[in-house]
């Protein structure tokens, strides 16, 4: 029977800069029941606070609701593991909410085959940013990535769309049914999950662009 091993806070994520959650990995438990507590203070403060919510994020997590989340202050936090034989602390972790944003997937993905008379046909893809993200303030720059493939293909074709919310693809296999998805990330955050797939049938007379 031993004191617990050193825990590690390994992940913090925010869907929108208004709330965030951090997760830790326990160290070895020393063969005894072990209690974990996360304490934190914000830059410029000395007063330590305990995690406000150990439930919402699941096991080994701390969730900071709206009233506990500030974009203006860096959070300094650590996890304490305690059993009957003693305690151990994680390294201190510094968190700036701006840099942990992982948005929800983009919305309203629409895909259409366009066949203008005077130009090559193309696949037109359009989407909207996730609802929770406020792009008007300028705090966020969202970048987008599209992936598509014929229904039975193994490999995805990936296109980086930058900040635009629509995209044209010229080179497609006629007569094939394609799956299309889009995801987004802030310039200094994490990729969202892929949006639900949208299916599109490419007409047999679609002329491939070389």
């Amino acid at each position: 029977q031993l004191p617990p091993g050193k825990p590690e806070i390994f992940k913090c994520r925010s869907p929108n800069k208004e709330t965030f959650t951090c997760w830790w990995r326990p160290g070895t438990d020393g063969g005894l029941p072990t209690n974990y507590s996360l304490t934190y203070h914000r830059e410029g403060e000395t007063l330590m606070h305990e995690c406000p919510d150990y439930i919402t994020g699941g096991p080994n997590s701390c969730h900071f609701g709206k009233q506990y989340t500030s974009m203006w202050r860096t959070y300094i936090m650590m996890v304490n593991a305690t059993n009957q034989m003693g305690s151990s602390f994680s390294d201190e972790l510094y968190v700036d909410v701006t840099y942990i944003v992982q948005p929800d997937p983009p919305l309203e993905l629409a895909v259409e085959v366009k066949q203008p008379e005077d130009r090559k046909p193309y696949l037109w893809i359009k989407w909207s940013p996730p609802t929770l993200i406020d792009l008007k303030t300028g705090w966020f720059t969202l970048l987008y990535e599209i992936r598509l493939k014929p229904e039975k293909a193994a490999e995805w074709e990936i296109h980086f769309a930058g900040q635009q919310t629509e995209f044209k693809i010229l080179s497609l296999h006629p007569g094939q049914k394609y799956l299309v998805q889009v995801r987004c990330k802030p310039d200094h955050g994490y990729w969202s999950a892929w949006s639900p797939a949208t299916f599109i049938q490419i007409p047999s007379d679609f002329t491939m662009n070389d």
Partner: antibody
Framework: EVQLVQSGAEVKKPGSSVKVSCKAS????????IHWVRQAPGQGLEWIGE????????NYNQKFKGRATLTVDRSSSTAYMELSSLRSEDTAVYYC???????????WGQGTLVTVSS | DVVMTQTPLSLSVTPGQPASISCRSS???????????LHWYLQKPGQSPQLLIY???NRFSGVPDRFSGSGSGTDFTLKISRVEAEDVGVYFC?????????FGGGTKVEIK
């Protein structure tokens, strides 16, 4: 204990390439961005770029775009910085650095001296 | 790119005396999120840089309280209230508000 251990000194010919490694230990490698900074002899510090080891997403200083390539090998918790078309002005100590969930770096490697000379 | 200008270039200080280093940026370092990402690093002789101050005025873990940072917008200052022998080295200011991140040219602090 968090450690960033870099590869040894290199001497290269002008026009060639160099690949510097930075092996991370003491933390979950995919959690934090790795930055690369260089320091020419007797000079200040110059930021080359950064990479997110979780998905290999990169941001480069435009000055180095096309000549510097940042990569990671997640299986060995190692980050790499490759610089091509070397010239004498690239002679410098190259550092890797690690951020927290922030955009400043708290941990630095010991540095790798790259000398470019004919 | 944001140009960071440090003054003075070098500083010779008697132990126990204060020291002050100035850093000026060519444009405001206030991020669109309201934070100011101006940091100070110390590079001791033969070593890698180490973080002293982050976001203008916050001491990093383990940094003695004789180090303090202040400023806003484009003008920033690092102060050492009482210089000790272990404080010798080159001090760099750095901004990470704008990409590319940039550094000042450095201020060499030595002991008289």
């Amino acid at each position: 204990e968090v450690q960033l251990v870099q590869s040894g000194a290199e001497v290269k010919k002008p026009g060639s390439s160099v690949k510097v490694s930075c092996k991370a230990s003491g933390y979950t490698f995919t959690s934090y961005w790795i930055h690369w900074v260089r320091q020419a002899p007797g000079q200040g510090l110059e930021w080359i770029g950064e990479i997110d080891p979780s998905d290999s997403y990169t941001n480069y200083n435009q000055k180095f775009k096309g000549r510097a390539t940042l990569t990671v090998d997640r299986s060995s918790s190692t980050a790499y910085m490759e610089l091509s078309s070397l010239r004498s002005e690239d002679t410098a100590v190259y550092y890797c650095g690690r951020s927290f969930f922030t955009n400043w770096f708290a941990y630095w490697g010991q540095g790798t001296l790259v000398t470019v000379s004919s | 790119d944001v140009v960071m200008t440090q003054t003075p270039l070098s500083l010779s200080v008697t132990p126990g005396q204060p020291a002050s280093i100035s850093c000026r940026s060519s444009q405001s370092l206030v991020h669109s999120n309201g934070n100011t990402y101006l940091h100070w690093y110390l590079q001791k002789p033969g070593q890698s840089p180490q973080l002293l101050i982050y976001k203008v005025s916050n001491r990093f873990s383990g940094v003695p309280d004789r180090f303090s940072g202040s400023g806003s917008g484009t003008d920033f200052t690092l102060k050492i209230s009482r210089v000790e022998a272990e404080d010798v080295g080159v001090y760099f200011c750095s901004q990470s508000t704008h990409v590319p991140f940039t550094f000042g040219g450095g201020t060499k602090v030595e002991i008289k």
